[in-house]
C-alpha cells in the first residue's frame, strides 16, 4: 500500500487561555528527510490553512514568526500547539503531512481533531 497513514486525536479541549495541543503521527512509507506539516481547519466543507512548517528530519519545526502555531518533532511524530484560540475557532483541525524529499512524494491527511474552545468568563468586579 502506497498510502501514508496519519493519526491524530479525535477531540481536544483548549485551555482557558486558548491553547490547544495535539500529536500528529504519520507512518512513513519511505525514508523522508524533508517533511512539511500543515494544519488545516475545516468548517462547513470549506478548508483553510491555519499554519504550515517544513522541517528536516532530526531538526525542529520552523513556523513563520507570526504563526499561531508552534511545534516539536520526534521521529514520525509532531507535537503541535495552536495558540490564541477563541470560542468561534471551535472546529475540525486536520493534520496534513507531505514527504517532500527524497522521491517519491507522499501525502498524508489525518481524520481531523475536533478542538473545542470555550471563552473564559470575565472576572467579576470585586469591591474591597
Amino acid at each position: 500500500c502506497k498510502a501514508m497513514h496519519v493519526a491524530q486525536p479525535a477531540v481536544v479541549l483548549a485551555s482557558s487561555r486558548g491553547i490547544a495541543s495535539f500529536v500528529c503521527e504519520y507512518a512513513s512509507p519511505g525514508k523522508a528527510t524533508e517533511v512539511r506539516v500543515t494544519v488545516l481547519r475545516q468548517a462547513d466543507s470549506q478548508v483553510t490553512e491555519v499554519c504550515a512548517a517544513t522541517y528536516m528530519m532530526g531538526n525542529e519545526l520552523t513556523f513563520l514568526d507570526d504563526s499561531i502555531c508552534t511545534g516539536t518533532s520526534s521521529g514520525n511524530q509532531v507535537n503541535l500547539t495552536i495558540q490564541g484560540l477563541r470560542a468561534m475557532d471551535t472546529g475540525l483541525y486536520i493534520c496534513k503531512v507531505e514527504l517532500m524529499y527524497p522521491p517519491p512524494y507522499y501525502l498524508g491527511i489525518g481524520n481531523g481533531t475536533q478542538i473545542y474552545v470555550i471563552d473564559p468568563e470575565p472576572c467579576p468586579d470585586s469591591d474591597f
Epitope: 500500500c1 500543515t38 488545516l40 490553512e49 486536520i94 496534513k96 522521491p103 512524494y105 507522499y106
Partner: antibody, heavy 118, light 108 residues
C-alpha cells in the same frame, strides 16, 4: 476571481523549445503546490510535473524527465514550464492545475495548445 | 507507479437513468487520495469528488463516490443532459500522480 490562465503555446518544430506560463490570481499562490497536466488530441489526462510551495522540490513524469523544467515565481504569482527537445508525442493541450489543500487538483486553467510538427 | 483502470470505456445511458463508473487501482490507494473529474469537450477538467466520497464545492448531490482500497465507484443517480461527458479518476497520494484512461458517458 480565483483563476489560472495559461499562455505560451504554439507550433514548434521537433527538437525545438517552448516556455509555457500560468498566471494565478484570487488566491495565495505560495500556499499551494502546482502541477502541469497534458492531454494529447483525443486522449486522456497525463500528469507532467509538480512543484512544491517554495519551488525547492520538483517532480516529473518519466516521459519528460531531462527535457522539461518546472519553475515558479511566487512574487509574480506565476508558474512556468520550460520545454526543450520537443517531440511529436509532446503535442497536447497543457493545463496548469492547483494542488488543493487536501490534495486533489481543485483549480485548472483553460489550457494552451502545443503542436510539435515539422 | 499506481495504475488506475476505468470501466467501462464508454457508457450509454438515457437521461434520468443511473450511471455507475468504476475505477480499479493496481495497488491499494487510501480513500483520502482518490478523486473524480468531469471533462466536457473543449473544456478543462473539473473536480467532482475528492477523498473518494466528498463532493467538491458546487457539485450537485446526484454525484456520489464510494469505495476503498483498490476499488472505487462514481455514481450519477439521475443523469441530466449536462452530465454527458468524460470522467476520470485520479490518485494523488504519491508521485507520480496518475489518472485513469477515462469513461465516456454518452446519450443512449
Amino acid at each position: 476571481e480565483v483563476q489560472l490562465v495559461e499562455s505560451g503555446g504554439g507550433l514548434v518544430k521537433p527538437g525545438g523549445s517552448l516556455r509555457l506560463s500560468c498566471a494565478a490570481s484570487g488566491f495565495t499562490f505560495s500556499s499551494y503546490t502546482m502541477h502541469w497536466v497534458r492531454q494529447a488530441p483525443g486522449k486522456g489526462l497525463e500528469w507532467v510535473s509538480f512543484i512544491s510551495y517554495d519551488g525547492n522540490y520538483k517532480y516529473y513524469a518519466d516521459s519528460v524527465k531531462g527535457r522539461f523544467t518546472i519553475s515558479r515565481d511566487n512574487a509574480k504569482n506565476s508558474l512556468y514550464l520550460q520545454m526543450n527537445s520537443l517531440r511529436a508525442e509532446d503535442t497536447a493541450v497543457y493545463y496548469c492545475a492547483r494542488g488543493g489543500l487536501l490534495g486533489p487538483f481543485d483549480l485548472w486553467g483553460q489550457g494552451t495548445m502545443v503542436t510539435v510538427s515539422s | 507507479e499506481i495504475v488506475l483502470t476505468q470501466s467501462p470505456g464508454t457508457l450509454s445511458v438515457s437521461p434520468g437513468e443511473r450511471a455507475t463508473l468504476s475505477c480499479r487501482a493496481s495497488q491499494s490507494v487510501g480513500s483520502s487520495y482518490l478523486a473524480w473529474y468531469q471533462q466536457k469537450p473543449g473544456q478543462a477538467p473539473r473536480l467532482l469528488i475528492y477523498g473518494a466520497f466528498s463532493r467538491a464545492t458546487g457539485i450537485p448531490d446526484r454525484f456520489s463516490g464510494s469505495g476503498s482500497g483498490t476499488d472505487f465507484t462514481l455514481t450519477i443517480s439521475r443523469l441530466e443532459p449536462e452530465d454527458f461527458a468524460v470522467y476520470y479518476c485520479q490518485q494523488y497520494g504519491s508521485s507520480p500522480w496518475t489518472f485513469g484512461q477515462g469513461t465516456k458517458v454518452e446519450i443512449k
